[in-house]
């Protein structure tokens, strides 16, 4: 039985050219996290964090995606095209798969609202 829940940063905004941390957290379960996948709005892979093998960053993003903190992902040099949904998929044992969603809005304005708890200034 899957008792856990995924907590995410929810809807966040960040400045064009800036950085943002995408963060999910699995709670209310003792299940072991074996792998976390990060995907973009079109379901294309951004990164994988395997508990035993470490990180795999999709090659085209390697210059602007930084692993961490923790199981999260730091997106750098943001462009307007980065606006959209992001998904974290947690593979766990013995529970199975959990999925979380984050919506990122990249703002042109230099006075972008800092609504993300995990955002880098």
């Amino acid at each position: 039985m899957m008792t856990g829940t995924i907590e995410t940063t929810g809807n966040i905004s960040a400045k064009k050219g800036g950085s943002v941390i995408l963060q999910c957290h699995l709670s209310s379960t003792m299940a072991q996290v074996t792998q976390v996948n990060w995907e973009q709005h079109d379901h294309s892979l951004l990164a994988i964090r395997n508990a035993e093998l470490g990180w795999h960053i999709y090659p085209a993003f390697k210059d602007r995606v930084a692993p961490g903190p923790g199981l999260g992902l730091t997106l750098q040099s943001l462009t307007m095209n980065d606006t959209g949904e992001y998904f974290c998929t947690y593979h766990t044992y013995p529970d199975g798969t959990y999925r979380g969603r984050i919506f990122l809005e990249v703002l042109e304005s230099s006075v972008a609202e800092h609504s993300a708890r995990f955002q880098i200034p």
């Epitope: 792998q35 093998l53 090659p59 390697k62």
Partner: antibody, heavy 119, light 107 residues
């Protein structure tokens, strides 16, 4: 065109070390992780470890952890695998293989380097 | 370690035959399975990753299926250049492990 060109065959004595090189071309070396896999005569493939050429961070198969070191030279786009304390069971073909776009599998392989351990 | 078994270990087939190779895994690996083809004296060649995604340049007669612990590689119509040994590999944990191989030869 992606190419992984490995160093030539080696003959080593038991207890010695061997260092195999793998020169990459046709892609951005630091954007793709590199794996090392070996195959003893008539045996299945055996994964040894992987490295991130960008950071130099590596992960090893526990079986080889105390004897294998994987390194890179970013300037020459070359990966290296050094195996120490060689024994006859280490006689095998050693492959470097580039990690794929979508995970920990390998999409391009070097031609292989035969390492023979014999007294 | 995750254990990989393949069946059959070898098979004889004719050009045009439909060939199916099975890979069984000791624990749930979701869809993190790759298939490789290897010819004598040559390096392995990637055919399929993520259980069912065909690698670039691989003919459409090859297909992969399965998830969890049971996986299949199918060659819909065997061609002369397909006679080789086929290996499955999980790409989910450390160590990455390969199956023992299935040798496909000419009947």
């Amino acid at each position: 065109e992606v190419q992984l060109v490995q160093s030539g065959a080696e003959v080593k004595k038991p207890g010695a070390s061997v260092k195999v090189s793998c020169k990459a071309s046709g892609y951005t070396f630091t954007n793709y992780y590199m794996h090392w896999v070996r195959q003893a005569p008539g045996q299945r493939l055996e994964w040894m470890g992987r490295i991130d050429p960008d950071s130099g961070g590596s992960k090893y198969n526990e079986k080889f952890k105390s004897r294998v070191t994987i390194t890179v030279d970013k300037l020459s786009s070359t990966a290296y695998m050094e195996l120490s304390s060689l024994r006859s069971e280490d006689t095998a073909v050693y492959y470097c293989a580039r990690e794929g776009h979508y995970g920990f599998y390998s999409d391009y392989w070097g031609q292989g380097t035969t390492v023979t351990v014999s007294s | 370690d995750i254990q990989m078994t393949q069946s059959p270990s070898s098979l004889s087939a004719s050009v045009g035959d439909r060939v199916t190779i099975t890979c069984r895994v000791s624990e749930n690996i979701y869809s993190y399975l790759a298939w490789y083809q290897q010819k004598p004296g040559k390096s392995p060649k990637l055919l399929v990753y993520n259980a069912k995604t065909l690698a670039e340049g691989v003919p459409s007669r090859f297909s992969g299926s399965g998830s969890g612990t049971d996986f299949t590689l199918t060659i819909s119509s065997l061609q002369p250049e397909d006679f080789a040994t086929y290996y499955c590999q999980h790409h989910y944990g450390n160590p990455l492990t390969f199956g023992p191989g299935t040798k496909v030869d000419i009947k």
